[in-house]
Interface confidence: low
């Protein structure tokens, strides 16, 4: 199928990194970098499982789909894909599994048609807040990105900076409000314990959000209200115990939503009553008949849809004078 046809914009030589980062010689039309496979007809270049340590400088100008998976890139510097003339048609860039541990500010600058970016399966210990926005301005030029795949980018425990991994990722997503047009965001398998409360409100175009296989315990402070276009929300394989009324109402109010909640350790006590009532009425939960209780022990494996209010009790909290040590 066809892809973007943006005209190549000329570079200003005043850009500070261009002297070192930009390939000055235009590549020959049919040139293919060493260790890569190229198809001009498919506008595709594949440099896969080649243990490359840097992005090839001589990428053909026609490239629309670039696969640089299974390499050893380690660091993506500023302007890693800046070329003269620019790679004006590059729309899909897959860098998954390339041992990236650092993505610097402006790494994806000068890619005017970049719609889809996959950085999955890289241990990103250092993701610059300006990796996607390219500048530290409070409001950056809009990024053309509409699909950002960041599954399993959490580094091993001993390689993490002394800061919140969730915070680092969210800072990159929100910097300069550059990703306002983002439509698909995948953040699966990242050990997220929480979702910073402001992140979704600033990504209003999202259609698909994948937060599966994390460690989310609660959505109490997360608002979905602004995500009026959201079509799928993947929350499978987290540590969710219950969804409260506010969250339920917000999800129910989204016109196109499908929610996936499998494999969470639902706690079936008195706090679950609202969620069970909602589940029985709603059509937005995919596979709702598969949801089962994990706690308390007496409720384990009970199907949520089959519970009634009598099943959902909380042990009474005794006044201090009656408690035993």
């Amino acid at each position: 199928s066809s892809s973007p046809t943006s005209s190549a914009s000329s570079f200003s030589s005043s850009a500070p990194f261009l002297a070192s980062a930009v390939s000055a010689q235009p590549p020959l039309p049919d040139q293919c970098p060493a260790l890569c496979e190229c198809s001009e007809a498919a506008r595709t270049v594949k440099c896969v499982n080649r243990n490359l340590t840097e992005v090839p400088t001589d990428l053909p100008a026609y490239v629309r789909n670039l696969f640089l998976t299974g390499n050893q890139l380690a660091v993506l510097p500023a302007g890693a894909f800046a070329r003269r003339p620019p790679l004006a048609e590059l729309a899909a860039l897959n860098l998954s599994g390339s041992r990236l541990d650092e993505v610097r500010a402006g790494a994806f600058e000068h890619l005017p048609s970049l719609r889809q970016l996959d950085l999955s399966h890289n241990p990103l210990a250092d993701l610059s807040p300006f990796a996607f926005s390219g500048s530290n301005a409070s409001v950056s030029a809009p990024s053309p990105l509409v699909e950002l795949i960041l599954n399993h980018i959490v580094p091993p425990e001993d390689e993490r900076q002394n800061r919140s991994f969730e915070g680092m990722v969210v800072a990159a997503l929100l910097a300069g409000r550059a990703l306002q047009g983002l439509r698909r965001l995948e953040l699966a398998s990242n050990h997220f314990l929480y979702l910073p409360r402001d992140v979704l409100a600033q990504l209003p175009s999202l259609r698909h959000l994948d937060l599966s296989n994390n460690s989310l315990v609660s959505l109490t402070y997360v608002s979905f209200r602004n995500l009026t276009h959201l079509e799928s929300l993947h929350l499978e394989d987290n540590a969710l115990k219950v969804l409260h009324n506010g969250t339920l109402a917000e999800l129910q109010g989204l016109p196109h939503i499908r929610v996936f909640l499998d494999n969470n350790p639902w706690v079936c006590d008195c706090h679950m009553a609202d969620m069970v009532t909602w589940l029985k009425e709603t059509e937005v939960v995919q596979g709702k008949d598969r949801l089962t209780c994990a706690y308390p022990e007496k409720m384990r494996n009970r199907v949520l849809l089959e519970l009634n209010s009598a099943d959902l009790d909380c042990d009474p909290i005794l006044p201090p004078s009656l408690q035993t040590s």
């Epitope: 699909e147 439509r183 698909r184 259609r207 499908r258």
Partner: antibody, heavy 125, light 107 residues
């Protein structure tokens, strides 16, 4: 080769029912989004209904509660069940794939491509 | 819902001439706009998507431009088979909506 072949149109009285079919070849109806779009005689195009790959269905306000979109995965066929038909439902009805033009497993923006050949539904007494 | 207004309603031109069709949205649709061509008795055909990208198999004489609320479809040099009705369509906000169409006819 991708093809959408429609059938089921015809003349029906107000208040009556009709079921349109759209047989798909070249891709699987269950793995894509599918829509119905209609065109009243001499008029423009109006989106009617959509079914997502996950099974969610949505309708234009003008047909909500009267029309039902569905599919039969085993027959690779899309349906539009139209009940309580009115004169203003008279139109050529087209099925169309709601297509992501960039590929690479993305769903970020979808357009109607390709379309079925259309089938005329006339509601008149 | 977003209203798309196309102009002119009819464009009378000769083969070889340049056609410029306009589509204006009642609010911003970013670049989430497509153009379709429909010939009498036929189904519409996707020409341009995401405002400026040609669909598969569409000749280079068709081009799209614009973003936000103002969009243009240009046919650089009309061929006999290009005389048809052209519709714009947005996919930015729900529901999907179409313009009322511009008819390009032979002068």
């Amino acid at each position: 080769q991708v093809q959408l072949v429609q059938s089921g149109g015809g003349l029906v009285q107000p208040g009556g029912s009709l079921r349109l079919s759209c047989v798909v070849s070249g891709f699987t109806v269950s793995s894509d989004y599918m829509s119905w779009v209609r065109q009243a005689p001499g008029k423009g195009l109006e989106w009617v209904s959509i079914i997502y790959s996950g099974g969610s269905t949505f309708y234009a306000d003008s047909v909500k509660g009267r029309f039902t979109i569905s599919r039969d995965n085993s027959k690779n066929t899309l349906f539009l069940q139209m009940n309580s038909l009115r004169a203003e439902d008279t139109a050529v009805y087209y099925c169309a794939r709601d297509r992501d033009c960039h590929g690479w497993g993305s769903y970020y923006n979808r357009w109607f491509d390709p379309w079925g050949q259309g089938t005329l539904v006339t509601v008149s007494s | 819902e977003i209203v798309l207004t196309q102009s002119p309603a009819t464009l009378s031109l000769s083969p070889g001439e340049r056609a410029t069709l306009s589509c204006r949205a009642s609010q911003s649709v970013s670049s989430y706009l497509a153009w379709y061509q429909q010939k009498p008795g036929q189904a519409p055909r996707l020409l341009i998507y995401d405002a400026s990208n040609r669909a598969t198999g569409i000749p280079a004489r068709f081009s799209g431009s614009g973003s936000g609320t103002d969009f243009t479809l240009t046919i650089s040099s009309l061929e006999p088979e290009d005389f048809a009705v052209y519709y714009c369509q947005q996919r930015s906000n729900w529901p999907p909506t179409f313009g009322q169409g511009t008819k390009v006819e032979i002068k």
